[in-house]
């Protein structure tokens, strides 16, 4: 009889994560007596995987019968892979022994390589808005990828970009890898509508990119445009002066009306108008009592947009008095400035 | 270690039934056949029955097929052999033994069983 | 049925002598490139132990001096130097197809 060998026919299996492992292996004789264990491994720290004579393994189950008579198949499926898995599992005969059974042969091995999709990028940007013409960087991560190739591009709005930085870890042999990427992307005001995209390309995604993608609306801040004018005088004493609050973004803002330096007025944007690049477009209105004053005015808006410092503009209004038929009635001229 | 402990001894009466037990330890009882086998007093070994405790496939000798029963509890590991219309000639030390080859063989024996058949 | 025959139904060697006990089967045990046969060892009071399986690979722990060969339809157990631990009785088996056993050999030190 020609002595026992264990043949694991397969050097390399390779399993998609999830999926179940069938790990070959053979004997060529029933001679000697003894089970047969299945380790990961080599070496003192190897990890038992199945061992035939004892113990549970909930994922491991046989190929065949292994109570069946002339048996010497010892092939184990594995179920429910992870990229934790991967690496070389060994076919071990042990033959009978008193008290303790005594390794015989061990199989070639076989390596068990696990492809695990990446997790579906995560897009972040700065913590803080920015205003056009600054450039704010984005990272976009995935994790748990197996094996370690994968492709990463930027999109904004569809246009890739160019400026970044990518980086896979661990550098070395790991089961699962990540991958970190900061792009490098310039504000414009019209980006409140614009989108980031990261995209990563893997061969477990069978030419199906995952995608991430971070909305600009997040993180720009569009400033906005001041225009105080003074509408037609509506009653006899009294002078309508508006605030146009124009592109801005985001809608929080307050605005404030001072005369002569004194608050009036403080109201925040409610009804506010949205442009087709996303950006808001709000007006207030003060009613100015000109009786009430013998020199000339000095009107602000002064309005505070998205926690920022204010911004203001000024109208002067021309306080002089004029005779009338019956007691007198005031005019008003208006002359403007602009502070900041 | 393997080990196979057996019930204590029983005397039963004519026509009457018993049931050994075989509880198995120090091995995954249902990796491995157990076969039971009986010997008469002064006189040599006769094989009884075999049982897969994984599925219950069952063999029997002909001769006991129609009064032997081997079943199985793998929740507490042990084996059963029910013998009914006992006789005298019954009277045996009953071993439940393991086969840890799958040769049909037995590898590992219980210490036995004495069942004595007396009106 | 395959019917096992030992002989002889018993035997007394001397210490240090070789003991040799046969086992006949009636058609051959011989399948699958094996022989079927396996050899007991029971000491009185004692459970049987198994000594050789497939006619001739000794079990774990037996001493060298014991032996199995044969093929088809004889096979032989063979004890080159006999001690005194060794006296029993030695039962063959076959698995060819459901077990049987051999009627027994007493071995006795002369």
């Known amino acids: 009889e020609e002595e026992l060998q264990v043949i694991q026919p397969d050097k390399f299996v390779l399993v998609a994560a999830g999926e179940t492992a069938t790990l070959r292996c053979t004997a060529t004789s029933l001679i000697p007596v003894g089970p047969i264990q299945w380790f990961r491994g080599a070496g003192p720290g190897r990890e038992l995987i199945y061992n035939q004579k004892e113990g549970h393994f909930p994922r491991v189950t046989t190929v065949s019968d292994l109570t069946k008579r002339n048996n010497m198949d010892f092939s184990i499926r594995i179920g429910n892979i992870t990229p934790a898995d991967a690496g070389t599992y060994y076919c071990v005969k042990f033959r009978k022994g008193s008290p303790d059974d005594v390794e015989f042969k061990s199989g070639a091995g076989t390596e068990l390589s696990v492809r695990a999709k990446p997790s579906a990028p995560v897009v972040s940007g700065p913590a803080a808005r920015a205003t056009p013409q600054h450039t704010v960087s984005f990272t976009c991560e995935s994790h748990g990828f197996s094996p370690r190739d994968i492709t990463l591009k930027w999109f904004k709005n569809g246009n890739e970009l160019s400026d970044f930085q990518t980086n896979v870890d661990p550098v070395g042999e790991s089961v699962s890898y990540s991958i970190h990427s900061t792009a490098k992307v310039v504000l414009t005001r019209e980006d409140v509508h614009s989108q980031v995209i990261c995209e990563v390309a893997h061969v477990t995604l069978q030419g199906d990119p995952l995608r991430g993608t971070a909305n600009l609306s997040e993180t720009i801040r569009v400033p906005p445009t001041l225009e105080v004018t003074q509408q037609p005088v509506r009653a006899e004493n009294q002078v309508n002066v508006t605030c146009q609050v124009r592109k801005f973004y985001p809608q929080r803002l307050q605005l404030t009306w001072l005369e002569n330096g004194n608050v009036s007025r403080t109201e925040t944007a409610s009804t506010v108008t949205e442009n087709k690049d996303g950006t808001y477009n709000w007006m207030s209105w003060l009613l100015v009592n000109v009786s009430a004053h013998r020199d000339d005015v000095k009107l602000t808006c002064q309005v505070e947009h998205d926690g920022q410092p204010a911004v203001s503009k000024s109208h002067d209004l021309k306080v002089s008095a004029h005779p009338k038929e019956q007691g007198s009635n005031t005019a008003a001229e208006n002359t403007g400035s602009n502070e900041r | 270690q393997v080990q196979l402990v057996q019930s204590g001894a029983e005397v039963k009466k004519p026509g009457a039934s018993v049931k050994v037990s075989c509880k198995a330890s120090?091995?995954?009882?249902?990796?491995?056949?157990i076969n039971w086998v009986r010997q008469a007093p002064g006189q040599g070994l006769e094989w009884i029955a075999m049982?897969?405790?994984?599925?219950?496939?069952?063999h029997y000798n002909q001769i006991f097929k129609d009064r032997a029963t081997l079943t199985t509890d793998t929740s507490t590991s042990t084996a059963y052999m029910e013998l009914r219309s006992l006789r005298s000639d019954d009277t045996a030390v009953y071993y439940c033994?393991?086969?840890?080859?799958?040769?049909?063989?037995?590898?590992?024996w219980g210490r036995g069983t004495l069942v004595t058949v007396s009106s | 049925d395959i019917v096992l025959t030992q002989s002889p139904d018993s035997l007394a060697v001397s210490l240090g002598e070789r003991a040799t006990i046969n086992c006949r089967a009636s058609?051959?045990?011989?399948?699958?490139?094996?022989?079927?046969i396996f050899w007991y060892q029971q000491k009185p009071g004692q459970p049987p132990k198994l000594l050789i399986y497939?006619?001739?690979n000794r079990d774990s722990g037996v001493p060298d001096r014991f032996s199995g060969s044969g093929s088809g339809t004889d096979f032989t157990l063979t004890i080159s130097s006999l001690q005194a631990e060794d006296v029993a009785v030695y039962y063959c088996?076959?698995?060819?197809?459901?077990?049987?056993f051999g009627q027994g050999t007493k071995l006795e030190i002369k």
């Open positions: 049982i897969d405790p994984s599925d219950s496939e069952t």
């Open positions: 120090g091995y995954t009882f249902t990796n491995y056949w």
């Open positions: 497939l006619a001739s």
């Open positions: 058609q051959s045990v011989r399948s699958s490139g094996y022989n079927w």
């Open positions: 033994a393991m086969d840890y080859g799958s040769l049909y063989a037995m590898d590992y």
């Open positions: 088996q076959h698995s060819r197809e459901l077990p049987t």
